[in-house]
Amino acid sequence: KSPIFGPEEVNSVEGNSVSITCYYPPTSVNRHTRKYWCRQGARGGCITLISSEGYVSSKYAGRANLTNFPENGTFVVNIAQLSQDDSGRYKCGLGINSRGLSFDVSLEVSQGPGLLNDTKVYTVDLGRTVTINCPFKTENAQKRKSLYKQIGLYPVLVIDSSGYVNPNYTGRIRLDIQGTGQLLFSVVINQLRLSDAGQYLCQAGDDSNSNKKNADLQVLKPEPELVYEDLRGSVTFHCALGPEVANVAKFLCRQSSGENCDVVVNTLGKRAPAFEGRILLNPQDKDGSFSVVITGLRKEDAGRYLCGAHSDGQLQEGSPIQAWQLFVNEESTIPRSPTVVKGVAGGSVAVLCPYNRKESKSIKYWCLWEGAQNGRCPLLVDSEGWVKAQYEGRLSLLEEPGNGTFTVILNQLTSRDAGFYWCLTNGDTLWRTTVEIKIIEGEPNLKVPGNVTAVLGETLKVPCHFPCKFSSYEKYWCKWNNTGCQALPSQDEGPSKAFVNCDENSRLVSLTLNLVTRADEGWYWCGVKQGHFYGETAAVYVAVEERKAAGSRDVSLAKADAAPDEKVLDSGFREIENKAIQDPRLFAEEKAVADTRDQADGSRASVDSGSSEEQGGSSR
């Protein structure tokens, strides 16, 4: 018997779509071999309609696809716009059509529902609203109007014009009688339930002259949209529930065991702990639509998600919903990068951010995730030379090492820097990644003076002490500006005496500024790197003042000012223009991106995501 398994029978109606899942043993050979869907002919052959190698028959052009899920041992054939001609016997299989690795599937497509014996068919999605129109003649204009539902053999009164409402419909039904000019009454049912489906009869009058109209209400459970995203990547759920629920609380939930749909995020401020730091619920439009972005996708994020609207902010019967089945592809194109980076107060971190290497010219961004309300991510820095004012002198985004990775360096760390940060570009929105910065106990490895004052026209020498652990690293000094950090010449002054228990491999490397000018004022960094991979940095602010006494200045560690954690930026520092992002794709399709660089900067607590992928501030 064949090890391939699938649905033996699929029944649908014209115009519908089907998703046929075929299961195979996930051996390494099976995972990578050809997958196919073919139609069995009268004489025993099987004509390929679609395969995993890219072939699509003209019969399926524009309406079918085949997706392999090697990690699950499944492949899915989606066929849209079904017609009765699609009825027949098919095979889904592996390898060559004529071989035995296949499974027989019977597809039966029947005619769509028509207007049979004067029955009006209403097809409405679960949770939405239906309006059943009931015409009547003039002689029944003043008579009782009613709507019945056929339950078995008996009609059961649902609502009438005298004020009766069946308890099953309380709070979600009304009967509207149109103005005198129109011989029509309407019954509007909101928050449709699956149990509302069935045959209805509306009636004007109660005698033999009454006007009757049959209605067939079909309530559709939303077909889950299949979404396939890469491990460590990002997914965006776009939820359009209609303007009638524009002012109702929205939610995204994930179906777990039983009837439970655990809230992932809602507009009432609830957020599941597993999504801390990696989820944003984007503001609603006037039509009630909204979107949810989840980054740093994990294997356990796979499952069925529902978005909906209900005053409780969670799934209830009658909630209008949309559904997705999220598959997380473990054979990811997105490289592993640390999800947690650790630094010490006063120290630094260097974060590696992956991006789609086909989009090397895209603008790179780094933002700070804030959990308040529905989550937001104000930008801190971009690759076009913009840095948020509060981060001047201590934050830099570098295009290095390139080829699919950029680097973000943040120094002068304080406990307020703990939190979640997102790496993103204005290109492929699937390549958003999340990193958590944790501030741990310890001392910075690099030692520099605090604030330094240079004298116009004189020479200034600023020391940077590197412990022996960095003996194999390249050591550098650079001058920070909002486009990066320009390398400067520096001198190796031999072993440092700033470290206890550190041998001759420690180093004192000095920056020398000859004939200081006003242009020399600013932030200077010393740091270590290996090739294009950056490690720790330390920052010094050099102020320039008028000459008071002759001679050069040599700054020592003993003259350091306040501790780094207490450093207050002088109010006179230049503030970069708070420009708005021009690219509307930045946060998927959110529209309100202009405020993503606002100046609010509240304190943030560190939240441990329990990640096993951690790195220290000085590692790469």
């Epitope: 033996e8 649908s12 499944t74 559709l220 459970k221 069925r304």
Partner: nanobody, 126 residues
Framework: QVQLVESGGGLVQAGDSLRLSCAAS????????MGWFRQGPGKEREFVAT??????????YYTDSVKGRFTISRDNAKNTVYLQMNSLKPEDTAVYYC?????????????????WGQGTQVTVSS
Amino acid sequence: QVQLVESGGGLVQAGDSLRLSCAASGRTFTTYGMGWFRQGPGKEREFVATITWSGSTNYKYYTDSVKGRFTISRDNAKNTVYLQMNSLKPEDTAVYYCAASTVLTDPRRLNEYDYWGQGTQVTVSS
């Protein structure tokens, strides 16, 4: 919760037919598939047949040993799933359990079903 109640089991002769019913009540709007499993004397519970649905599309899955003999169907209005069993054999003797699932990635796996009925005994004598 979703409650499942099976009925229709009994004692029949080999070659006879039986129709099992499974009526679902409660929060059935969250279910996406219902199926039948069976547990013969001294055996593990095994997959028999499942029907899943999406809108007006139904997908029917069967285990090899019942193909062509058993048919699964559902009545949406009554929230009921049926298993029509024809040409019954003594090896079909088992307690038949109805199960419902909210998220079904492989209909053959027991652990993908969230709700279970109490079971109905089917005995086929030779």
